[in-house]
């Protein structure tokens, strides 16, 4: 898949035979299938589309600049976000724990996968391609790509469910700490994301290829079993269905249920009693919805280009070059937008949430201070897990914090 978070080829791409199992489309990464000399069944080479090289050359540098920017912004933003949630007891709660999980997934991708991708873009080859560390990176790279996207997707689903649960049980006002159910959710999300990424680690190998007599090696998805052949065939649809449609459908369902719940209880006396609290819950729900919308906008172009490639593009068509140029351009734009999603959440939270904005400002200037003006007095109850500092005395000082410390 491409070297960019959702794919190899890559990117990566010997002559014009690249990423998509013997087609010309250089989709990254180096490397759906990265750069390999994949040939038609008769073993002969065909002519290429001239625009491909021009687009690839132009985007090589554009992608590098964007990747470096995403690396810096993503590392600073996600690390700061994690620091804010970890250091501030008032910020340690269910939805924020899920946001921290989201940030950690993005941070892992940004720190490990992006540098590999930039190397691949600039050097035109897989790092350490002639030793065992290169083989390890070849398996790690797509594994972390898929894990990171999986973590994002499942956390967004969990946040949507969490918002519905928060509204459905008005009286359940949580104190400081992470609810046990949220902790279990997070652990499950990470385990499931890693499990779903295992086929990538199995399927991606360093494949040797020859070009003009010279021996090269590239990292690509190479099906060697019936299951991996099946996975390779359905991969684009699986990615589109599970890693794109599922979180949107999940959000749509639970936000519809949440809206119905709010409308049904609109005139309840409990609602009046907790009007301030509900207002804040609505704000958190808006923030979560904003994260889902950003996810959809970032990932839609890439998924669309992949699906169009799968359904519309015919490599044997003599007039394929115009469509190829469009798909290639769309794919590169999609790759950059999708990669951008791994650094955009902290930025989105900065603009959407007043509390996060203040914490970001103070944390980036010095260290995030706990300002009492940011807290709203709400009673606490419910079982919770403290990340840090279990001293009961501290609970009194932090009584003002509540489950939805996000607005």
């Amino acid at each position: 898949d491409n070297p960019e978070r959702y794919s190899t080829n890559l990117s990566n791409h010997v002559d014009d035979f690249t990423t998509f199992r013997g087609t010309e489309l250089s989709f990254l990464v180096t490397t759906h299938q990265p750069t390999n000399l994949v040939l038609p069944s008769n073993g002969s080479m065909h002519n290429y589309c001239p625009q491909q090289t021009k687009i690839t050359s132009a985007f090589k540098y554009i992608n590098t600049v964007i990747s470096c920017t995403i690396f810096i912004v993503g590392m600073v933003g996600n690390a700061t976000l994690l620091r804010i949630i970890y250091q501030n007891k008032c910020m340690r709660n269910g939805p924020n724990a899920l946001i921290a999980s989201l940030a950690l997934g993005d941070l892992i991708y940004v720190v490990i996968d992006l540098p590999i991708n930039v190397f691949k873009l600039l050097a035109g080859r897989w790092p350490f391609d002639h030793n065992d560390f290169g083989v390890f990176l070849c398996k790690l790279f797509p594994f972390l790509q898929k894990s990171s996207v999986g973590i994002t997707v499942l956390n967004l689903c969990a946040l949507s469910v969490d918002r519905y649960r928060a509204v459905a049980s008005w009286s359940r006002v949580q104190g400081i700490g992470i609810p046990l159910v949220t902790a279990i959710e997070i652990v499950s999300i990470w385990i499931l994301s890693f499990i779903l990424a295992i086929p990538e680690a199995i399927g991606f190998v360093m494949v040797p290829f020859e070009y003009r007599g010279e021996q090269h090696k590239t990292c690509m998805l190479n099906a060697t079993s019936k299951f991996m052949e099946f996975y390779q065939d359905v991969k684009d649809w699986w990615l589109f269905g599970f890693y794109f449609c599922m979180p949107l459908v999940c959000t749509a369902i639970f936000y519809t249920l949440m809206t119905c719940e709010m409308l049904n209880r609109r005139n309840g006396s409990l609602r009046i009693a907790l009007s301030e609290h509900l207002k804040q819950r609505r704000e958190v729900a808006k923030t979560v919805f904003c994260l889902v919308v950003i996810f959809a906008l970032c990932w839609f172009p890439l998924h669309l280009s992949r699906i169009l490639k799968k359904t519309v593009y015919n490599e044997m068509d003599k007039n394929r070059c115009e469509l190829l140029s469009f798909l290639l351009l769309m794919d590169y734009i999609g790759i950059n937008l999708a990669t951008m999603n791994s650094c955009i959440n902290p930025i989105a939270l900065y603009f959407v949430s007043k509390k996060f904005k203040n914490c970001f400002q103070s944390c980036l200037c010095c260290c995030c201070y706990q300002s009492k003006s940011l807290m709203t007095s709400v009673p606490m109850n419910g079982t919770s897990i403290q990340w840090k500092n279990h001293d009961q005395n501290n609970h009194n000082t932090d009584r003002s914090s509540h489950k939805d410390s996000m607005n």
């Epitope: 002559d15 180096t30 080479m45 080859r125 020859e210 003009r212």
Partner: antibody, heavy 116, light 112 residues
Framework: EVHLVESGGGLVQPGGSLKLSCAAS????????MSWVRQTPDKRLELVAT????????YYRDSVKGRFTISRDNAKNTLYLQMSSLKSDDTAMYYC?????????WGQGTSVTVSS | DVLMTQTPLSLPVSLGDHASISCRSS???????????LEWYLQKPGQSPQLLIY???NRFSGVPDRFTGSGSGTDFTLRISRVEAEDLGVYFC?????????FGSGTKLEIK
């Protein structure tokens, strides 16, 4: 020392066939790509066909596709070009060249004339 | 096809002079492995072509350091710092990055 020696050229009528050979010595033949390049009477160079180390991958220029076949025998250290349905446009000096990221060694060439 | 345009077609020089031959490709010739397979060949009168420069700027073994290759993307140049009698002949540029591989039309280096 690397040596490439072409043979099999000659005068042939349009529609006829010829098989060119290129005997290689002085290097490990099976580890190099090989190509046939021709030089037309107006001195232009054209890549005719190329083959990878094990013979599994071949390339032909459009004008010879379906008429020419490039092959190799690694046991005999020999490269071949089977030419059929020859046209007057195929008249040229045919060179075989070793390819390893560049065509670093060339043979002296064999002349092919297609004329009635 | 990638069209390789060489200029000039003929280059009259005096021995000891500097010479420069330009080659322009109609498209980018960077291969997907990151390598630009741009070569320069010299064909001396009555001989087969011989490799001078490969991958834009690398001199082939035995080629004097008078020969320098440079360029990127679509524009490439071969420079000969001090022309000697043995340098006379036809110079061809060649791209081996994209099928079909193509040669330039040639530049004849001759004595003024």
């Amino acid at each position: 020392e690397v040596h490439l020696v072409e043979s099999g050229g000659g005068l042939v009528q349009p529609g006829g066939s010829l098989k060119l050979s290129c005997a290689a010595s002085g290097f490990t033949f099976s580890t190099y790509g090989m190509s046939w390049v021709r030089q037309t009477p107006d001195k232009r160079l054209e890549l005719v066909a190329t083959i990878n180390t094990n013979g599994g991958t071949t390339y032909y220029r459009d004008s010879v596709k379906g008429r020419f076949t490039i092959s190799r025998d690694n046991a005999k250290n020999t490269l071949y070009l089977q030419m059929s349905s020859l046209k007057s446009d195929d008249t040229a000096m045919y060179y075989c060249a070793r390819d390893y990221g560049a065509m670093d060694y060339w043979g002296q060439g064999t002349s092919v004339t297609v004329s009635s | 096809d990638v069209l390789m345009t060489q200029t000039p077609l003929s280059l009259p020089v005096s021995l000891g002079d500097h010479a420069s031959i330009s080659c322009r490709s109609s498209q980018y010739i960077v291969h997907s492995t990151g390598t630009t397979y741009l070569e320069w060949y010299l064909q001396k009168p009555g001989q087969s072509p011989q490799l001078l420069i490969y991958k834009v700027s690398n001199r082939f073994s035995g080629v004097p350091d008078r020969f320098t290759g440079s360029g990127s993307g679509t524009d490439f140049t071969l420079r000969i710092s001090r022309v000697e009698a043995e340098d006379l002949g036809v110079y061809f540029c060649f791209q081996g990055s994209h099928f079909p591989f193509t040669f330039g039309s040639g530049t004849k280096l001759e004595i003024k």
